[in-house]
C-alpha cells in the first residue's frame, strides 16, 4: 500500500505567486494596486534611484535576517534620506582645526519632515563614503550630547582600500532621541581611536563631502555622496491603521 | 460538508515527547541513555554545579535565538571553564602600576586540555565579576598581540551597580587563534576608554580576583569568582562522528 | 544547510529551497512597481519525515534528527529559515516612494 | 507575537505556542540527567489558514496576512519562532559533564 503523493509543482508555484500578490499589498497596506494614472512620464528621478540603490546595497550587505518580527515590522518601511548640513554652514567653524575628528551636523526639522513621530522610526543609519586609503585605522563615532560633551556610539577598524567605500553606522536610538527633543542642529563626531598610551591621534580617514579638496564641477555628484542619514520608517497613515487594529491581538 | 478536524492534543503531546526523547539523545550522539552504574553517590560536585549555573545564567541573559544553525551547532556542546593564571604569577609583575588597565593571563595548555582542536570550539566567553560601584565608566577589552602591542576587541558602558555583576565578552575568535598557535601564556587587557581629549584615564572598575583587597579566609570563594574563560566545544569523539558523516549532505 | 547553494545544485527530494523568480509584470500582471522588475522569491518544499523513536536501527534514526526534525516537532514542516528583505520603488499619486519589504526572499529552508 | 505571554493566557484556536513540561523521570523514564529535573519544552500547534486572494472583502483578507501567512507560503505551517537552549548535567562513567543543547525550549510560534 503506497502512501506516496505526487507534488504538483505548478500548483505550488501558482499558490506561492498568489500568496506573494497578497503579501506585497498587505505589507504596503494597499487594498489594491495604486493607479498609475498620475505617474509622470520618463525615467525615475535621480534622487529616488540613488535612494533605492542605497537601500538595495544595504540589503546586499546585510546577513539574512530570520529574527522574530514584531507586528509593526511586518509592514513596509518607507525609506528617505537626510543630507548633512552643508559644510559652508557657520556651525562647522569651530571644528575646522581639530585633527583627530571630523564633524557632521544635521537639521532635526529635516528629519522630522521624513519621520513626524519618534515611534514611527524603525531604523536610522549614518552613511559616510570613505575615500581610498592606504592606512589602517581604528575609528570611533560619537553623538553630540551637550554643549561640549560627546557620547560614544561605536567603533570600526578600517583597513586599507583601493576604492571609495560606504561606511554605515546604526544610529536609530540617537535619531529617535533627537525627534523626542525640539528642533535644532544635532551632530556626530567621527574620530581616531585614541588609546591610553598612543601619541599619534590624527584621523587619517578622508570622508567624501567633508575632505577639503572639492572641485567645482563635481559639486552635485559630491553632494549626493556627502554624509547622510538613511531613514526607515512606517508612514504615518499606515501607523494609524496599525494602531487602530491593535485590539485584534 | 465540514472539513474540521478535531486535534487529539494527547496524541500531539505524546508525539512531541517521543520526538524530544530522540532529539536529546541525537544531540548528544548517544544511541541509548548512558549507564548510571559508575555514578558516585551524593550530590553533584561544587565545581560542576557552578559551571552548570554559569551556563544556565548565560541562557537566561540571552535573548531567544532563532538563528539558522550550521549542522555542527545542532549537536550538544560540552561546557568547561579555565581560570585565569593566579595573580601571584610573576607575569603580572610589570602590569602592577598601570592605573588605566587590569590584565588577565591564561595558560593555553589549560585551554587545549578542554578543547584539543581549534575547530571544535563553538564559543568562548571571558567572564569577569565586577564589584559594586557608584561610578559609570566606558571600558575596553584588548587582546595581547605581540610583545607590547594590544588589539582592540570591544567595549562596554558600565553603569553604577549595587551588587556584584558578571560581565561577559565573546572571545571565540581570540581563543581559536591561541589554539592555533603553540602553548604559552596569552592575555587580555581591560582598560578605561581613553578619549582624545580626556585627562582622567584611570580605570575605576574593580574586578573580583584582581582587586588587591583579598582577605585570606575568602580565598577559595574569591578564587571561584576570579576571571575565567567559559568554553563551549564539541567533544572530540562527537566531532569525529560528525566529520565522517559529512558526505551525507 | 538547505540553502540556495546546496538545493539549486542538487536533486534533493526532501525539504529544500526551490527556485522561483517573480516577474511583477508577467506573473502578477502589475506595472506599478517601477524597481525592481522582479525578484527571486523562492519557496520551501519537500517532506520532513517524522521520526518516531523506532527502536530498529535507533542509531540511524538519531543521525537523521538533525536533518528531518531538529526541533523535535510532533509534525515537522519544511519552512523558510533565512529570509532577506526587498526594497521597491512605486508611485502613490505623483509621488515616488522607496519602501523596504521585510522577509521577502527565501534563502534557506529547514524542517521545523 | 504568538509567544508564551499571549498564548498561555488565551484560548487561541489558531497557531500558538502550547504548554508542555517535560519531567525527565516521569515523561521519558530517564534518571541519567542530573540537572535540571525537567524543563518547559512547549510546542507549536494550530492552523494557519491559507489565504488565497479571495476577491470578497479583499481588504479584510489583507489584514490577516500578517497573522496567518506572513511569509506568503503556498501552505503555511505553525512552527517555532524563538527558541532557547537548555544546559544539562549528566555522567559519562564517573565523569560529570555539563553540556548545552541548542534550540530546546519553544518560546514563540509563527505561521511560516
Amino acid at each position: 500500500l503506497s502512501t506516496c503523493k505526487t507534488i504538483d509543482m505548478e500548483l505550488v508555484k501558482r499558490k506561492r505567486i498568489e500568496a506573494i500578490r497578497g503579501q506585497i499589498l498587505s505589507k504596503l497596506r494597499l487594498a489594491s494596486p495604486p493607479s498609475q494614472g498620475e505617474v509622470p512620464p520618463g525615467p525615475l528621478p535621480e534622487a529616488v534611484l540613488a535612494l533605492y540603490n542605497s537601500t538595495r546595497d544595504r540589503v546586499a550587505g546585510e546577513s539574512a535576517d530570520p529574527e522574530p518580527e514584531p507586528e509593526a515590522d511586518y509592514y513596509a518601511k518607507e525609506v528617505t534620506r537626510v543630507l548633512m548640513v552643508d559644510r559652508n554652514n557657520a556651525i562647522y567653524e569651530k571644528t575646522k582645526d581639530i585633527s583627530h575628528s571630523i564633524y557632521m551636523f544635521f537639521n532635526t526639522s529635516d528629519i522630522r519632515e521624513a519621520v513626524p513621530e519618534p515611534p514611527l522610526l524603525s531604523r536610522a543609519e549614518l552613511r559616510l563614503q570613505r575615500l581610498k586609503s592606504s592606512v589602517e585605522q581604528h575609528v570611533e563615532l560619537y553623538q553630540k550630547y551637550s554643549n561640549n560633551s560627546w557620547r560614544y556610539l561605536g567603533n570600526r577598524l578600517l583597513t586599507p582600500t583601493d576604492t571609495p567605500e560606504w561606511l554605515s553606522f546604526d544610529v536609530t536610538g540617537v535619531v529617535r532621541q533627537w525627534l523626542n527633543q525640539g528642533d535644532g542642529i544635532q551632530g556626530f563626531r567621527f574620530s581616531a581611536h585614541c588609546s591610553c598610551d598612543s601619541k599619534d591621534n590624527k584621523l587619517h580617514v578622508e570622508i567624501n563631502g567633508i575632505s577639503p579638496k572639492r572641485r567645482g564641477d563635481l559639486g552635485t555628484i559630491h553632494d549626493m555622496n556627502r554624509p547622510f542619514l538613511l531613514l526607515m520608517a512606517t508612514p504615518l497613515e499606515r501607523a494609524q491603521h496599525l494602531h487602530s487594529s491593535r485590539h485584534r491581538r | 460538508l465540514s472539513t474540521c478536524k478535531t486535534i487529539d492534543m494527547e496524541l500531539v503531546k505524546r508525539k512531541r515527547i517521543e520526538a524530544i526523547r530522540g532529539q536529546i539523545l541525537s544531540k548528544l550522539r548517544l544511541a541509548s541513555p548512558p549507564s548510571q552504574g559508575e555514578v558516585p553517590p551524593g550530590p553533584l560536585p561544587e565545581a560542576v554545579l557552578a559551571l552548570y549555573n554559569s551556563t544556565r545564567d548565560r541562557v537566561a541573559g540571552e535573548s531567544a535565538d532563532p538563528e539558522p544553525e550550521p549542522e555542527a551547532d545542532y549537536y550538544a556542546k560540552e561546557v568547561t571553564r579555565v581560570l585565569m593564571v593566579d595573580r601571584n604569577n610573576a607575569i603580572y609583575e610589570k602590569t602592577k602600576d598601570i592605573s588605566h588597565s587590569i590584565y588577565m593571563f591564561f595558560n593555553t595548555s589549560d585551554i587545549r586540555e578542554a578543547v584539543p582542536e581549534p575547530p571544535l570550539l563553538s564559543r568562548a566567553e571571558l567572564r569577569l565579576q565586577r564589584l559594586k560601584s557608584s561610578v559609570e565608566q566606558h571600558v575596553e577589552l584588548y587582546q595581547k598581540y605581540s610583545n607590547n602591542s594590544w588589539r582592540y576587541l570591544g567595549n562596554r558602558l558600565l553603569t553604577p551597580t549595587d551588587t556584584p555583576e558578571w560581565l561577559s565578552f565573546d572571545v571565540t575568535g581570540v581563543v581559536r587563534q591561541w589554539l592555533n598557535q603553540g602553548d604559552g601564556i596569552q592575555g587580555f587587557r581591560f582598560s578605561a576608554h581613553c578619549s582624545c581629549d580626556s585627562k582622567d584615564n584611570k580605570l575605576h572598575v574593580e574586578i573580583n580576583g584582581i582587586s588587591p583587597k583579598r582577605r585570606g579566609d575568602l580565598g577559595t570563594i574569591h578564587d571561584m569568582n576570579r576571571p575565567f574563560l567559559l568554553l563551549m566545544a564539541t567533544p572530540l569523539e562527537r566531532a569525529q562522528h560528525l566529520h565522517s558523516s559529512r558526505h551525507r549532505r | 544547510a538547505l540553502d540556495t547553494n546546496y538545493c539549486f545544485s542538487s536533486t534533493e527530494k526532501n525539504c529544500c529551497v526551490r527556485q522561483l523568480y517573480i516577474d511583477f509584470r508577467k506573473d502578477l500582471g502589475w506595472k506599478w512597481i517601477h524597481e525592481p522588475k522582479g525578484y527571486h522569491a523562492n519557496f520551501c518544499l519537500g517532506p520532513c519525515p517524522y521520526i518516531w523513536s523506532l527502536d530498529t536501527q535507533y542509531s540511524k534514526v538519531l543521525a537523521l534528527y538533525n536533518q528531518h526534525n531538529p526541533g523535535a516537532s510532533a509534525s515537522p514542516c519544511c519552512v523558510p529559515q533565512a529570509l532577506e528583505p526587498l526594497p521597491i520603488v512605486y508611485y502613490v499619486g505623483r509621488k515616488p516612494k522607496v519602501e523596504q519589504l521585510s522577509n521577502m526572499i527565501v534563502r534557506s529552508c529547514k524542517c521545523s | 507575537a504568538l509567544d508564551t505571554n499571549y498564548c498561555f493566557s488565551s484560548t487561541e484556536k489558531n497557531c500558538c505556542v502550547r504548554q508542555l513540561y517535560i519531567d525527565f523521570r516521569k515523561d521519558l523514564g530517564w534518571k541519567w540527567i542530573h540537572e535540571p529535573k525537567g524543563y518547559h519544552a512547549n510546542f507549536c500547534l494550530g492552523p494557519c489558514p491559507y489565504i488565497w486572494s479571495l476577491d470578497t472583502q479583499y481588504s479584510k483578507v489583507l489584514a490577516l496576512y500578517n497573522q496567518h501567512n506572513p511569509g506568503a507560503s503556498a501552505s503555511p505551517c505553525c512552527v517555532p519562532q524563538a527558541l532557547e537552549p537548555l544546559p544539562i548535567v549528566y555522567y559519562v562513567g564517573r565523569k560529570p559533564k555539563v553540556e548545552q543543547l541548542s534550540n530546546m525550549i519553544v518560546r514563540s510560534c509563527k505561521c511560516s
Epitope: P33, S35, E237 | - | G29, K31, V92, G93 | D55
Partner: antibody
Framework: EVKLVESGGGLVQPGGSLSLSCAAS????????MSWVRQPPGKALEWLGF??????????EYSASVKGRFTISRDNSQSILYLQMNVLRAEDSATYYC???????????WGQGTTLTVSS | DIQMTQTTSSLSASLGDRLTISCRAS??????LNWYQQKPDGTVKLLIY???RLHSGVPSRFSGSGSGTDYSLTISNLEQADIATYFC?????????FGGGTKLEIK
C-alpha cells in the same frame, strides 16, 4: 463613519459664477485626495478634477472640459472641499457630487449631490 | 482619453435572477476597473474596485471579473434593493472616465 455633504447649488445665469462646498467628516481629511464629479440630467457621470492630499502637496488636476473655468480648493482646518465655477454655461447644468478618491483609481465614498441649473 | 462603453443601456430582470453587465475600454486598463451603483434618488456607492475587489459593506452577491479591455459585473440572486443604474469607471489613466451606465429594471 465617512460622510460627505455638498451644498451651494442653485440657479445661475450663463456667464455667472458659483461656489459649491462639501463638508467632510469621519476620516483624516488631509490624508485623501478629494474630487468633484458631475452628472447632467439623464446622462453619464463625468469626472471634473481633484485636489491631492498633504503628501502630494495639495496640487490640483482638472478635466479638459472645465480647465481654466473651475477651481478646486480645500480648507483643511475645517475639512471642507470647494468648487469655484466661473463663466458658467448651460451645459454645466448637472448634479455635482464630491467624492473621496483613493490611490487605487476609484472613488470610495460619495456625497448625496447638489444641483446646479444654468439658465437665463 | 480612454472611452468606456456600456453597450446595454437598460436591462430587465426578475427577482432571484443572475445577470451580467458588461463594460469595454478603448485600450488595456490593467484591471483598474471600478463599478458604482446609483439609486433612483441619486445616491452613488462604490461596489467593486480593481476589477473584482468587493468594497466593504457590499453584499457578496455582487462580483466582478475581466482583464485587458473587457470587464463585467455579475449580480446573482437579484433583490429589489438592486434596482439602480450601474456605472463602470477606469482608474488607469487620467482623466478618469465613466461608462454611460446600465439601468436595471424589474420585469
Amino acid at each position: 463613519e465617512v460622510k460627505l455633504v455638498e451644498s451651494g447649488g442653485g440657479l445661475v445665469q450663463p456667464g455667472g459664477s458659483l461656489s459649491l462646498s462639501c463638508a467632510a467628516s469621519g476620516f483624516t481629511f488631509t490624508d485623501y485626495y478629494m474630487s468633484w464629479v458631475r452628472q447632467p440630467p439623464g446622462k453619464a457621470l463625468e469626472w471634473l478634477g481633484f485636489i491631492r492630499n498633504k503628501p502630494n502637496g495639495y496640487t490640483t488636476e482638472y478635466s479638459a472640459s472645465v480647465k481654466g473655468r473651475f477651481t478646486i480648493s480645500r480648507d483643511n482646518s475645517q475639512s471642507i472641499l470647494y468648487l469655484q465655477m466661473n463663466v458658467l454655461r448651460a451645459e454645466d447644468s448637472a448634479t455635482y457630487y464630491c467624492a473621496r478618491y483613493t490611490g487605487g483609481g476609484y472613488f470610495d465614498y460619495w456625497g448625496q449631490g447638489t444641483t446646479l441649473t444654468v439658465s437665463s | 482619453d480612454i472611452q468606456m462603453t456600456q453597450t446595454t443601456s437598460s436591462l430587465s430582470a426578475s427577482l432571484g435572477d443572475r445577470l451580467t453587465i458588461s463594460c469595454r475600454a478603448s485600450q488595456d486598463i490593467s484591471n483598474y476597473l471600478n463599478w458604482y451603483q446609483q439609486k433612483p434618488d441619486g445616491t452613488v456607492k462604490l461596489l467593486i474596485y480593481y476589477t473584482s475587489r468587493l468594497h466593504s459593506g457590499v453584499p457578496s452577491r455582487f462580483s466582478g471579473s475581466g482583464s485587458g479591455t473587457d470587464y463585467s459585473l455579475t449580480i446573482s440572486n437579484l433583490e429589489q434593493a438592486d434596482i439602480a443604474t450601474y456605472f463602470c469607471q477606469q482608474g488607469d489613466t487620467l482623466p478618469w472616465t465613466f461608462g454611460g451606465g446600465t439601468k436595471l429594471e424589474i420585469k
